[in-house]
């Protein structure tokens, strides 16, 4: 049986059940290389409390559909008096990056995971030439996830004192220049994740090979190498390589630009101080507030919730968007869709789509950006579920009793962007984490 998601095959992936202190290793095409789980384990569970290992999915006992992968085992489990077998179930959804498997829940018999990934899309529009896993768990099993830094088109400019060269990078995947209208970036070779431009020439100085690594809990490392043979004439016989070290800052701060810290014989060392390198619980909440010692800040957007069936309305040319954030009030136009953001076509108001659901909510504060994300909306033709990204800005003089109002700023590939100026986005900082 052919591997259902070949682009995910090259790596062993990790997921964590934080509540029970369990680490899962997952290899969807072969077996994980963990002796304690046996030679054919595709999903290996490591219980850190009891220091035991169990195979909860066998690579030989795999069944797959386009959106579901199940690994059975021969181990019996007793659930409500019936004789079941232990199994793992991975539900796949279309995403814009390779993404990460997320542990959902476990019963006595079934371990459930969900994975939003380009590999599950109906169309190839989000697929990279080359992409590597862009997250890691530290020794305390806390997740560090750089997926939000991945650019689907374009690149980041590395801060470098050399006026004659420009070094462009992407994070965990190659640079897509197809949308570029003709700048220096356009000359970058396909597949490169680190592109050096000198004059009118562009050179591949690194492609992603291995996934993100953790060196300390506040430092993550990504390495790019130039795969193809043939040395560049300005590298003194050395093969180019790029090392990007992502550093979690010691206290809350605005984002910084990636900086070139060392350069020798086409070996480039880059340091990027960014809160995305911090563990995810420091940056994110499933509710509409971020507070407490863990987050170093106090943010509470719950006063923005609308009651009594009213919604915020944002005009988007062809569409009207109805928003009801930080609550579970149904938007009348999007009846029964559990939508936090509802898209209605102006020319045909019967065309209604959920652009993100209220139970699929993430509040993120990172690098000075406060963002509320609603995902899991109605599918687009690519298979990607519509989502909305609301960028909040502090405005102590916002109208509407300080609440302000959301402004639609655009759509890219079924992701809808809004900005929202409100006094409730004014962040109160605590001290060190």
């Amino acid at each position: 049986q052919a591997a259902p998601f070949p682009e995910l095959c090259s790596y062993t992936w990790e997921a964590v059940d934080t509540k029970n202190n369990v680490l899962y290793k997952i290899n969807i095409c072969g077996s994980v290389d963990i002796v304690q789980c046996g030679p054919s384990s595709a999903v290996c569970m490591h219980d850190l409390k009891t220091r035991t290992y169990h195979s909860v999915g066998d690579s030989v006992l795999r069944s797959a559909t386009r959106s579901l992968l199940e690994f059975n085992t021969t181990v019996s489990c007793d659930q409500q008096g019936t004789n079941h077998r232990v199994q793992s179930s991975i539900a796949f959804l279309c995403g814009k990056t390779l993404g990460t498997p997320e542990f959902v829940t476990a019963t006595e018999c079934v371990h459930y995971f969900e994975w939003r990934t380009t590999a599950a899309c109906k169309k190839d529009i989000f697929k990279a030439n080359k992409e590597v896993p862009c997250y890691v768990f530290d020794e305390e099993l806390r997740k560090h996830d750089l997926n939000p830094l991945i650019k689907l088109s374009g690149a980041y400019l590395v801060d470098d004192s050399d006026p004659d060269t420009s070094l462009f990078i992407n994070v965990c995947r190659d640079i897509d220049t197809l949308r570029d209208p003709g700048s220096q970036l356009r000359a970058c070779p396909p597949g490169t994740a680190a592109c050096l431009v000198r004059g009118h020439q562009a050179f591949d100085v690194g492609q992603p090979r291995d996934g993100l690594k953790v060196v300390r809990k506040d430092r993550l490392v990504l390495s790019y190498v130039r795969e193809e043979a043939g040395k560049l004439d300005f590298c003194d016989g050395h093969s180019p390589a790029v090392t990007i070290t992502f550093v979690c800052p010691s206290e809350r701060r605005e984002g910084t630009i990636p900086k070139l810290t060392a350069k020798s014989n086409c070996r480039y060392e880059i340091e990027w101080i960014t809160e995305y390198a911090c563990h995810r619980d420091y940056l994110e909440s499933k509710t509409c507030s971020l507070s407490g010692e863990q987050q170093d800040v106090s943010i509470d957007l719950t006063p923005l919730a609308q009651s009594g069936g009213s919604s915020y309305i944002s005009d988007g040319k062809e569409y009207l968007f109805y928003l009801n954030v930080c609550g579970e009030t149904e938007i009348q136009f999007c009846n029964k869709k559990q939508a936090a953001v509802c898209q209605v076509k102006k020319s045909d108001t019967s065309q209604v789509k959920a652009a993100g659901r209220y139970h699929n909510q993430t509040l993120r504060y990172s690098d000075g950006d406060l963002t509320l994300i609603y995902f899991g909306g109605d599918e687009c033709s690519s298979g990607f579920q519509r989502m909305s990204v609301i960028n909040f800005r502090c405005n102590k003089t916002a109208g509407n009793d300080g609440k302000g109002t959301p402004v639609f700023t655009g759509e890219v590939d079924c992701t809808y962007f809004f900005t929202w100026d409100t006094e409730y986005a004014c962040v109160h900082h605590h001290h060190h984490h």
Partner: nanobody, 123 residues
């Protein structure tokens, strides 16, 4: 390819104000970072201000901080540069440009350019 068309330039006295507009058409407005640049006679093109498309974060050249404001109206596919407290040294042709590179103020990283609009500040 994005097509850009600037307007709003003109002759103004020192201390006065102007608002430049740049209308974009063609390929998706939303995937770009937008910048304003200027070029005075006999000088190189220099960065004035930029706005990131995803978060609307802005950056400015030191020489215009506190006087100029970049903004955008996505409904109209238009970028603006509000220029207050103008000085004679602000005299230049002002260009609007689009880039898919983050964190850049380098004109060579901007691939689409308008034709420019002349701003003259008299003393």
């Amino acid at each position: 390819q994005v097509q850009l068309q600037e307007s709003g330039g003109g002759l103004v006295q020192a201390g006065g104000s102007l608002r430049l507009s740049c209308e974009a058409s063609g390929r998706t407005f939303n995937t770009y970072n937008w910048g304003w640049f200027r070029q005075a006679p006999g000088k190189e093109r220099e960065f004035v201000a930029a706005i990131r498309w995803s978060s609307s974060k802005t950056s400015y050249a030191d020489s215009v901080k506190g006087r100029f404001t970049i903004s955008r109206d996505n409904a109209k596919n238009t970028i603006y540069l509000q220029m207050n407290s103008l000085k004679p040294e602000d005299t230049a042709v002002y260009y609007c440009a689009a880039s898919i590179v983050d964190f850049t103020t380098n004109p060579s990283h901007f691939g689409s350019w308008g034709q420019g609009t002349q701003v003259t500040v008299s003393s």
